[in-house]
């Protein structure tokens, strides 16, 4: 997960945009990535970075938990 996020974040050269990406990686079981992104007011660049990293992180976590379930069988 960390490697993939670092790969994505590396393309954001504006520090705030990069940090928006990292914010998206934080675990939040109560809201979707879209719901969380809707509260961002600093600009579309932040929304885009947050959403991309949030979605990728969610997918990777889902894949990992799916693998864990398979291993547990």
């Amino acid at each position: 997960l960390q490697e993939k996020i670092e790969e994505i974040a590396a393309k954001y050269k504006h520090l705030v945009v990069k940090k928006c990406c990292y914010d998206g990686v934080r675990i939040n079981h109560d809201e979707t990535c879209e719901q969380r992104a809707a509260r961002i007011s600093v600009g579309p660049r932040c929304v885009k970075a947050f959403t991309e990293c949030c979605v990728v992180a969610s997918q990777l976590r889902a894949n990992n938990s799916h693998k864990d379930l398979q291993l547990g069988r």
Epitope: K13, H14, L15, V16, V17, K19, S41, V42, G43, P44, R45, C46
Partner: antibody
Framework: QVQLVQSGAEVKKPGSSVKVSCKAS????????IHWMRQAPGQGLEWMGY????????NYNENFKGRVTITADKSTSTAYMELSSLRSEDTAVYYC???????????WGQGTTVTVSS | DIVLTQSPASLAVSPGQRATITCKAS??????????MNWYQQKPGQPPKLLIY???NLDSGVPARFSGSGSGTDFTLTINPVEAEDTANYYC?????????FGGGTKVEIK
């Protein structure tokens, strides 16, 4: 209407520090990044750094080698720029500006003249 | 860091003529089709004022005689026709990455 109002002119001795304030009004302070630039007499604009008040995130121009510190007080909607170890070359007009959409500076403070002289 | 080179350093133009200022970036300021290049006007004793953002978008209240063009590394600010009140310094600025950088400026004088 959006306004950035800066503190008044300062005269400082070499080796001392200066702290310039930038009070924002007319918009939600935490929604936008505040940048600081300076302009030496007859020279161009030099970017110093910024703060995102909502999160406290900062970034600085490495040319200032740790001499600059930017802070923000959300309760008063005020950003501050402190420059230490002042030298004569730091004599300049210092500006704060709001960055809109992480793209461009749409509002600027009126500027604060800092003179460093022994 | 992205270095922005403006040319010419100064120019004198007659009223009604065209003034053209160029800004060359040391690397592309385009990100996913969006050019993070802006232009500002600064008159003596005043802070800079936004003219053009995203290479070609005129800020509100800016006269239509100002226009911006370009992409990637090469950008142009055009004033056509020039008026007496356009005497000022003009700066390009990139915001695609930190540190934000400015061009060295172009002084426009009216003949």
């Amino acid at each position: 209407q959006v306004q950035l109002v800066q503190s008044g002119a300062e005269v400082k001795k070499p080796g001392s520090s200066v702290k310039v304030s930038c009070k924002a009004s007319g918009y939600t302070f935490t929604d936008h990044i505040i940048h600081w630039m300076r302009q030496a007499p007859g020279q161009g604009l030099e970017w110093m750094g910024y703060i995102y008040p909502r999160e406290g995130w900062t970034n600085y121009n490495e040319n200032f080698k740790g001499r600059v510190t930017i802070t923000a007080d959300k309760s008063t909607s005020t950003a501050y720029m402190e420059l230490s170890s002042l030298r004569s070359e730091d004599t300049a007009v210092y500006y704060c500006a709001r960055e809109r959409n992480l793209e461009y500076f749409d509002y600027w403070g009126q500027g604060t003249t800092v003179t460093v002289s022994s | 860091d992205i270095v922005l080179t403006q040319s010419p350093a100064s120019l004198a133009v007659s009223p009604g003529q065209r003034a053209t200022i160029t800004c060359k970036a040391s690397q592309s300021v385009d990100y996913e089709g969006f050019n993070y290049m802006n232009w500002y006007q600064q008159k003596p004793g005043q802070p800079p004022k936004l003219l053009i953002y995203a290479a070609s978008n005129l800020d509100s209240g800016v006269p239509a005689r100002f226009s911006g063009s370009g992409s990637g590394t090469d950008f142009t600010l055009t004033i056509n026709p020039v008026e007496a009140e356009d005497t000022a310094n003009y700066y390009c600025q990139q915001s695609v990455e930190d540190p934000h950088t400015f061009g060295g400026g172009t002084k426009v004088e009216i003949k």
